[in-house]
């Protein structure tokens, strides 16, 4: 099955933005939203944001989770608000992957 081709005038979605690329903004606008988790020296760093251009997120969003990084992508306004990327687990839940700043 072929990849879906981006439309000539692609729809832009509002996404939650949390992380190093967000500056002082808490949202961004793009063709895809994402929620990611990376392990930095054993510490869980969660980020959320958007891919402004379809191609930008195309490869990233298709990358399967690894022990050190995971990305989940979606399309829709604020669709990444309640998404928390999860590392692959060996058949059990892993509390250490919940978002660091969610109560």
């Amino acid at each position: 099955m072929e990849d879906e081709k981006p439309k000539v005038n692609p729809k832009l979605y509002m996404c939650v933005c949390e992380g190093l690329s967000c500056g002082n903004e808490d949202h961004c606008e793009g063709q895809q939203c994402f929620s990611s988790l990376s392990i930095n020296d054993g510490f869980h760093v969660y980020q959320k944001g958007c891919f402004q251009v379809y191609e930008q997120g195309k490869m990233t969003c298709k990358t399967p989770p690894s022990p050190g990084q995971a990305v989940e992508c979606c399309q829709g306004d604020w669709c990444n608000r309640n998404i928390t990327a999860q590392l692959p687990t060996k058949g059990k839940s892993f509390p250490g992957t919940q978002n660091f700043h969610l109560e």
């Epitope: 949390e18 392990i39 930095n40 020296d41 054993g42 869980h44 980020q47 839940s93 700043h101 969610l102």
Partner: antibody
């Protein structure tokens, strides 16, 4: 109640070895990353090492890389720090720590003192 | 590695004073910053995580703020038990602590 109890500290000569242990209780040990942090006498805190849930991924500060090895035994709820080629500058209180599901370094043990001196 | 610079390195204050400690990162760390309190001979105790979230059981006189490179820990009304050393800690990349700020009795 979460408890972390370090042991294994003591006096060792430069170039010597020591193995620290951290016995954990009060939580499902195998679900959590674990950490070692140290503090030289009268100085600040320094992150030393981290280990993931199954022990397959380990991380080290540059100052200890190649000399220290972190490991864990989930059946014993214990994390270890094997310290080789010890130097005077490794003299410190070594703390074991863990994160809660959403908060890094939320819990710490009481620490164990390692003194490297001839 | 990211450098964390705390200021001041020490300060003298009285009970009831408002105390502010700052931490500056050498590069953007977003909100990936914690604050710890340490008393002599004791392990550090977590006060604030993710820059501004109060750890359970910590009195509300403690608060944190900041994002990017500049962060602040504020004690709104200093209590006798607050005299201690305070450390910031970033986990954005190459985890590092600030050098500490000792809060002493004036």
């Amino acid at each position: 109640e979460v408890q972390l109890v370090e042991s294994g500290g003591g006096l060792v000569q430069p170039g010597g070895s020591l193995r620290l242990s951290c016995a954990a209780s009060g939580f499902t040990f195998s679900n959590y990353y674990m950490y070692w942090i140290r503090q030289a006498p009268g100085k600040g805190l320094e992150w030393v090492s981290s280990i993931n849930t199954d022990g397959g991924s380990t991380y080290y500060a540059d100052s200890v890389k190649g000399r220290f090895t972190i490991s864990r035994d989930n059946s014993k709820n214990t994390v270890y720090l094997q310290m080789n080629s010890l130097r005077a500058e490794d003299t410190a209180v070594y703390y074991c720590a863990k994160s809660t599901p959403n908060i890094p370094l939320a819990y710490w043990g009481q620490g164990t003192l390692v003194t490297v001196s001839s | 590695d990211i450098q964390m610079t705390q200021s001041p390195s020490s300060l003298s204050a009285s009970v009831g004073d408002r105390v502010t400690i700052t931490c500056k990162a050498s590069q953007n760390i977003y909100k990936y910053l914690n604050w710890f309190q340490q008393k002599p001979g004791k392990a550090p105790k977590l006060l604030i995580y993710y820059s501004n979230s109060l750890q359970t059981g910590v009195p509300s006189r403690f608060s944190g703020s900041g994002s990017g490179t500049d962060f602040t820990l504020t004690i709104s009304s200093l209590q006798p038990e607050d005299f201690a050393t305070y450390y910031c800690f970033q986990y954005s990349s190459g985890p590092t602590f600030g050098q500490g700020t000792k809060v002493e009795i004036k």
